[in-house]
Amino acid sequence: MMTGTIETTGNISAEKGGSIILQCHLSSTTAQVTQVNWEQQDQLLAICNADLGWHISPSFKDRVAPGPGLGLTLQSLTVNDTGEYFCIYHTYPDGTYTGRIFLEVLESSVAEHGARFQIP
């Protein structure tokens, strides 16, 4: 039985040209995390394998940094980065847990007033 839950940063906003940390946390389970995948709807951004380390997809290599921890840092944000991001926790023996984050990338002046999207 899967007892775990994923906490995420939820809906977040960031300024165009800036950077943002995508973070998920798996709790309420003793399952071993074997791998965390960071994905958009149709493509893989990065993988953090517990044993083998990080893999960053080539199309994101210049703009994605691994960490902190199992999180992912997106840099040099553009408006096209707006959308859903998923953290997929592969665990043993539970299976797969998925968390969702919605990122809105705003023009500089708008972002200053976009705090309502920020989850502390």
Epitope: E39, Q43, L52, P58, H90
Partner: antibody
């Protein structure tokens, strides 16, 4: 340039163990993950497992769990793969392969080591 | 484990022909697929990764595409040195798995 040089061919009896080495050069040893892939005669490629030289972390295919051990010697930039309880089906060419910085595709390959298991 | 099913298993072509090999994953692997070429008695060589980037030094006649579960590898104009066996591989999750291979032979 990146080079992976493997130890020579081995002939083993069923039930024995074999230890194959893969000496690397031409890059910073701890930057690339190293994997072992085997190929039985006339067959396809099969991933055995991988090791992260940075921390010694290993990931093995379930099929080989309990029979395979991968280790690193950072002083000589060498990776080892030991396979125990050998059977005839383990007869294959064993390759070490390196995946680049933040990558899992196998860009660098050793020349292969033929392991023959025969009574 | 994720199964990678490659087709066809063998293929005959003439120099100059366009050939296409397909690989189907048993589950969504996003864009985490690579293609290798192997000649008899030699180690495989990385050609295409993720799944449309050509590796350093790989000629432009080799290309790859796809996402999710369906992937395609194409040689736009087969050259004599291209007769070999080609493998797809997924690295979305361990254990990393390969297709069974496609042998490209001279017609």
């Amino acid at each position: 340039q990146v080079q992976l040089v493997q130890s020579g061919a081995e002939v083993k009896k069923p039930g024995a163990s074999v230890k194959v080495s893969c000496k690397t050069s031409g890059y910073t040893f701890t930057e690339y993950t190293l994997h072992w892939v085997r190929q039985a005669p006339g067959q396809g490629l099969e991933w055995i497992g991988g090791i992260n030289p940075n921390n010694g972390g290993t990931s093995y295919a379930q099929k080989f769990q309990g029979r395979v051990t991968m280790t690193v010697d950072t002083s000589t930039s060498t990776v080892y793969m030991e396979l125990s309880s050998l059977r005839s089906e383990d007869t294959a060419v064993y390759y070490c392969a390196g995946s680049g910085y933040y990558d899992y595709s196998f860009a660098y390959w050793g020349q292969g080591t033929l392991v023959t298991v025969s009574s | 484990d994720i199964q990678m099913t490659q087709s066809p298993s063998s293929l005959s072509a003439s120099v100059g022909d366009r050939v296409t090999i397909t690989c189907r994953a048993s589950q969504d692997v996003k864009n985490a697929v690579v293609w290798y070429q192997q000649k008899p008695g030699k180690a495989p060589k990385l050609l295409i990764y993720s799944p449309s980037y050509r590796y350093t030094g790989v000629p432009s006649r080799f290309s790859g595409s796809g996402s999710g579960t369906d992937f395609t590898f194409t040689i736009s104009s087969v050259q004599p040195e291209d007769f070999a066996t080609y493998y797809c591989q997924q690295h979305y999750s361990t254990p990393f798995t390969f297709g069974q291979g496609t042998k490209l032979e001279i017609k």
